[in-house]
């Protein structure tokens, strides 16, 4: 099926940019691995590149406003031509729960204390207003809440007391258009504008000013432009040639606004001064190769002795790594395929451990399954040996750092029944359903 | 001492899937994972998940085929095994660790006691 095919992929936002055009199969669109694809406009954007997993969403709102509640967050395997590690096919979600609290306690109402007495009325003639007030302590409000209604009401109030008004202007209302929109017309352009003495109209008993001055002023317009003339487009230029030596790329004719060229401020062209095609090369971009991550640390030996375990002899061990993906004679990979260190082997040495501190909670678990669970621990930790951090293993060669490799067997005193592991599990509360974020937006 | 109990084992053919679990009367270890032993082979080691972190690691021979997971409340370790082979056929085998969980050092090379009694998984056409 044909794709709309784009120039980048933004890993921040997943959303893809630079629109190359529609009508091409996802093949040809991702001969360039560098380019991203939709299915549809304001669809999933997946990049041509092998896929991967997104970067973890921000953790959505806590399911409750108050109280203990649970979050999600997700990301998806983005990509094409492959699948993410563990077998994931691109588009796939995977979840993570965790528990959250906004605010450790609900807001409760309040209630109010009787009313106050009235205050006096708020003019000394014709008809005001008056006001009392009550108080939100009637018991107080707790933890945010509120008291409902209203502190204060009013209600009108007559002074029995006639008052004078004396006429004022309201503000002028607008200059009318002016009669002609360029110089040069059949009519001298003038505008006029009007206001009223009704801001206040002024009273009869007792009797009011009038309003000072005209109620009508008229002006000639000045300023003027001499009248437009449009724009007019001339003919398309030649075809630019295909900017790109592999994949996709787009050629562009332009034309000119000035057939005639616009006067006295008339409109441009309407329309776009360049258009586009897509060009395509058939050729597949070079892929450089990318390091996978370090593999683990080869046991900790010494050439020509059985074992160093537990004693204070350093060894060397090793760690590699495979370069992937370079294709089309990109480029290989920088830097070294193999990492050497020194180290001391403390694999399965009897040491004296300490009970650790308590560790935060963990991820609820399983995150879209029922009655999703976290938990926390104290480990028993070895005290690792006062070995000397650094040795000279070569004459003349200097000092070299030397690193503890190993699993060790700590012991420690019992508690709560266990030797090794004491943990706490508990229930995650208001748990949020599981929903593609896709899907919620159609 | 923690007492392992293996179920799930069986006969399948080549291409199926079997799901095996642990049940663990206890929780005082490091780690839990699955080893396998065919006739006339040593022991070796399949896949295991920290308890601290929830980690997890697999032998090349069964990367994206085989996934470890864990039931907090039932106190019971899984492994998933699809596109199940013949050289996959051996008596499986849950044990626990208790060497400590050194950052970066996968946990088959831990100090693994407190063996079950076995499920045996046979694949054949």
């Known amino acids: 099926d044909p794709v709309l095919c784009f120039t980048q992929y933004e890993e921040s936002s997943g959303k893809c940019k630079g629109l190359l055009g529609g009508g091409v199969s996802v093949e040809d669109c991702c001969l360039n691995t560098a380019f991203a694809y939709q299915k549809r406009s304001g669809g999933l954007c997946q990049p041509c590149r092998s896929p991967r997993w997104s970067l973890w969403s921000t953790w959505a709102p806590c399911s409750v406003t108050c109280s203990e509640g649970s979050q999600l967050r997700y990301r998806r395997c983005v990509g094409w031509n492959g699948q993410c590690s563990g077998k994931v096919a691109p588009g796939t979600l995977e979840w993570q729960l965790q528990a959250c609290e906004d605010q450790q306690c609900c807001p409760e109402m309040g209630g109010w204390s009787g009313w106050g007495p009235w205050e006096p009325c708020s003019v000394t003639c014709s008809k005001g207003t008056r006001t009392r007030r009550r108080a939100c302590n009637h018991p107080a409000p707790k933890c945010g809440g509120h008291c409902p209604g209203q502190a204060q009401e009013s209600e009108a109030c007559d002074t029995q007391q006639v008052c004078p008004t004396h006429g004022a202007w309201a503000t002028w209302g607008p200059w009318t258009p002016c009669s002609a929109s360029c110089h040069g017309g059949p009519h001298e352009p003038k505008e006029t504008r009007s206001r009223k003495c009704s801001a206040p109209e002024p009273s009869q008993k007792p009797p009011g000013k009038p309003c000072p001055g005209l109620a009508y002023e008229q002006r000639r317009c000045t300023g003027l432009p001499p009248c437009p003339v449009a724009g007019g487009w001339g003919p398309w230029g030649p075809v630019s040639p295909c900017p790109v030596t592999c994949g996709l790329g787009q050629t562009m004719e332009q034309r000119t606004c000035n057939h005639p060229v616009p006067q006295h401020g008339g409109p441009f062209c309407a329309g776009d001064a360049t258009r586009t095609h897509i060009c395509n090369t058939a050729v597949p971009c070079p892929v450089d190769g990318e390091w996978d991550s370090w593999g683990e640390w080869s046991p900790c030996i010494r050439r020509n002795m059985k074992s160093i375990s537990c004693q204070e002899i350093p060894g060397q061990q090793s760690r590699g790594r495979t370069c992937r993906g370079r294709k089309f004679d990109g480029h290989r990979c920088a830097g070294q395929q193999q990492d050497i260190r020194h180290c001391y082997s403390i694999q399965h040495c009897p040491l004296k451990g300490s009970w650790s501190e308590w560790s935060t909670w963990g991820l609820c678990m399983p995150p879209c399954g029922p009655n999703p669970t976290r938990a926390r621990q104290r480990l028993c930790t070895p005290l690792l040996p006062k070995y000397p951090p650094t040795v000279s293993m070569v004459e003349g060669q200097g000092e070299k750092n030397v690193t503890f490799w190993g699993r060790p067997l700590p012991r420690c005193e019992e508690l709560q029944g266990q030797k090794l592991v004491v943990e706490e599990k508990r229930p995650c509360l208001h748990v949020p359903a599981c929903k593609d974020p896709e899907e919620e937006e159609l | 001492q923690v007492q392992l109990v293996e179920s799930g084992g069986g006969l399948v053919q080549p291409g199926g899937s079997l799901r095996l679990s642990c049940a663990a009367s206890?929780?005082?270890?490091?780690?839990i994972g699955w080893f396998r032993q065919a006739p006339g082979k040593e022991r070796e080691g399949v896949s295991c998940?920290?308890?601290?972190?929830?980690?997890?690691y697999y032998a090349d021979s069964v990367k994206d085929r085989f996934t470890i997971s864990r039931d907090y409340a039932k106190n019971t370790v899984y492994l998933q095994m699809n596109s199940l082979k013949p050289e996959d056929t051996a008596v499986y085998y849950c044990?626990?660790?208790?060497?400590?969980?050194?950052?970066?050092?996968?946990?088959?090379?831990?100090?693994?006691?407190?063996w079950g009694q076995g499920t045996q998984v046979t694949v054949s056409g």
């Open positions: 044990g626990l660790d208790r060497s400590y969980p050194t950052g970066g050092i996968s946990c088959l090379f831990g100090d693994f006691g407190s």
């Open positions: 206890g929780s005082d270890y490091y780690a």
């Open positions: 998940m920290s308890r601290t972190d929830g980690s997890t």
